[in-house]
């Protein structure tokens, strides 16, 4: 089959980073400056990608490979193959239509991307909290207040004795 | 072929007052949603101000009540008026197209034009 299509139609002799020029007489030209075919025979070559503004280069374009781009430093990429670059914001804070601004109290935010999300509900599963939440972090939950009320039984059991003179493994 | 020139940058004393413009070309302008971003030295970029086809305007907090964007569609033009100017406001000034419609935030098929520098100064 390959072989008879090949026959049938030259194009496809044209490997990656040249096109069919159907104004040549169907010979392989190679891609022009800033342009590139990543498969064999295409009858025209892809535009590169060009970065700029908050885009910065990551791979360079070449006559068989598009160019990659990521973010400048200050923002990060969201979509498929970077296609959105995105300002970070501080610990503690979410990008709003105001700009960055800080987590409302009860929320938080460890990242520099992202919403600002509600502290744990340490109730919700019968615990207390352990250590109180800010705005670049979670609420830490700790045993439930029944644990912890005088005379109760651990829920965890003491750790063995151990003997003298015997160190820990 | 896009084209996004600005201009109307210099040098001003803090409190003073500049107005940069963008010139569009080679795109629908009145449909296009519209930023403007700066770069100060040393610093990364910082989304500053968009405003949409419709006209509604958008600030980062910093500038919000000192900066006016607006824009004239029979001139493909996008404007910043910058007011009560500080030091802080030193940086290079970059018109862009706004296709992401969200703060902060640039598509890929963005245009941009090559900035234009402010610098506050006494």
């Known amino acids: 089959f390959e072989r008879t299509r090949s026959l049938q139609d030259p194009c496809s002799n044209c490997p990656a980073g040249t096109f069919c020029d159907n104004n040549r007489n169907q010979i392989c030209s190679p891609c022009p400056p800033n342009s590139f075919s990543s498969a064999g025979g295409q009858r025209t070559c892809d535009i590169c990608r060009q970065c700029k503004g908050v885009f910065r280069t990551r791979k360079e374009c070449s006559s068989t490979s598009n160019a990659e781009c990521d973010c400048t430093p200050g923002f990060h990429c969201l979509g498929a193959g970077c296609s959105m670059c995105e300002q970070d914001c501080k610990q503690g804070q979410e990008l709003t239509k105001k700009g960055c601004k800080d987590c409302c109290f009860g929320t938080f935010n460890d990242q520099k991307r992202g919403i600002c999300r509600p502290w744990t509900n340490c109730s919700l599963d019968g615990k207390s909290v352990l250590v109180n939440g800010t705005k670049e972090r979670d609420v830490v939950c700790g045993p439930s207040p029944a644990d912890l009320s005088p005379g109760a039984s651990s829920v965890t059991p003491p750790a063995p004795a151990r003997e003298p003179g015997h160190s820990p493994q | 072929e896009v084209d996004l020139v600005e201009s109307g940058g210099g040098l001003v004393q803090p409190g003073g007052s500049l107005r940069l413009s963008c010139a569009a070309s080679g795109f629908t302008f009145s449909r296009s949603a519209m930023s403007w971003a700066r770069q100060a030295p040393g610093k990364g970029f910082e989304w500053v101000s968009g405003?949409?086809?419709?006209?509604?305007?958008y600030y980062v907090d910093s500038v919000e009540g000192r900066f006016t964007i607006s824009r004239d569609n029979a001139k493909n033009t996008v404007y910043l008026q910058m007011n009560s100017l500080k030091p802080e406001d030193t940086a290079v000034y970059y018109c862009a197209t706004w296709g992401s419609q969200q703060i902060g935030v640039w598509h890929e098929d963005d245009y941009w034009g090559q900035g234009t520098q402010v610098t506050v100064s006494s």
């Open positions: 405003i949409y086809s419709g006209g509604s305007t």
